[in-house]
Interface confidence: low
Amino acid sequence: FERTRSLQDPCSNCPAGTFCDNNRNQICSPCPPNSFSSAGGQRTCDICRQCKGVFRTRKECSSTSNAECDCTPGFHCLGAGCSMCEQDCKQGQELTKKGCKDCCFGTFNDQKRGICRPWTNCSLDGKSVLVNGTKERDVVCGPSPADLSPGASSVTPPAPAREPGHSPQ
């Protein structure tokens, strides 16, 4: 097992980018190509991540830090450290098991990822629909008819749904 690091432990002197080589009398040896150690005192170097296929390299591996990947055009990252690439869809679509599908009427998606969501129900806030929703955009809620007087603000942002379970339509 690994000895407790102390002033007497030669491995504690090995900096990041090296490893404590037991085969060479615990000399600090540089990490081999395509490997890295991000902290000192390491007994081994870690293999660099390789960004292949749908992944592309955002940051090259160095002796002290791992490579970082992102996704090729048409895909987006999911997970910590871009552990997965998921297919983009167009705005107004959502990704299903059968591919990208248009949002159903009454729903929208303003991203290239994620799912279609119901339009905001303006009436839950006592407002009226100022601009109709589309597949790509939520409705814009305006003031209630009673509020339409000279000098009244004509546009407010889409209102959040007020009560659990109410489906904005």
Partner: antibody, heavy 113, light 110 residues
Framework: SLVESGGGLVQPGGSLRLSCAAS????????MNWVRQAPGKGLEYIGI???????YYASSAKGRFTISRDNSKNTLYLQMNSLRAEDTAVYYC?????????WGQGTLVTVSS | DIQMTQSPSSLSASVGDRVTITCQSS????????LSWYQQKPGKVPKLLIY???TLAFGVPSRFSGSGSGTDFTLTISSLQPEDVATYYC??????????FGGGTKVEIK
Amino acid sequence: SLVESGGGLVQPGGSLRLSCAASGFSLSNYYMNWVRQAPGKGLEYIGIISSSGSAYYASSAKGRFTISRDNSKNTLYLQMNSLRAEDTAVYYCARGDYGMDLWGQGTLVTVSS
Amino acid sequence: DIQMTQSPSSLSASVGDRVTITCQSSQTVYNNNLLSWYQQKPGKVPKLLIYYASTLAFGVPSRFSGSGSGTDFTLTISSLQPEDVATYYCQGGYSGWIYVFGGGTKVEIK
């Protein structure tokens, strides 16, 4: 990655603003959430902010909590007002609207006199 | 308010056992499938296991699976491993941007 900050000890009735700094991706392209966990308890949902900037809240958070973000700083915020002892929890920011695939390490908020 | 009821609240099983956790929602989740499962190990941050009720998140072992639709959902661990000791949470999403977590299920090894 996501890194929360701004937690600490606050008196009942006080206010606190939590921050969540994102790196490695653009916050504005994602739906972002706040979730909290009281000591020894389960996860409790607070709210979400959409990529277009609209925020939606759990019924328990409406009126006292406000979610916002600064795209230029790639940072998400949670403004908490009129804090109560029962708001004591670890507060997490998390990414995603159909599954939260990336979480911060959390920041502890303690409400006590 | 919408309720997400997880059962059991805790369980103890042997290594290799098949473990099933259920989650019942008081209302139908959005699209019948907007249901996620998370694993939280002691002292750690929650980790996404399953989304869209049955889609395995990247890097999650295939012994985990999810099923169900509408209001009733199940997380199954086909062969329990020591590293699966954790609390598991379901989370439903609903129209109006409502999200609710279940109360959690603590899984231990006998």
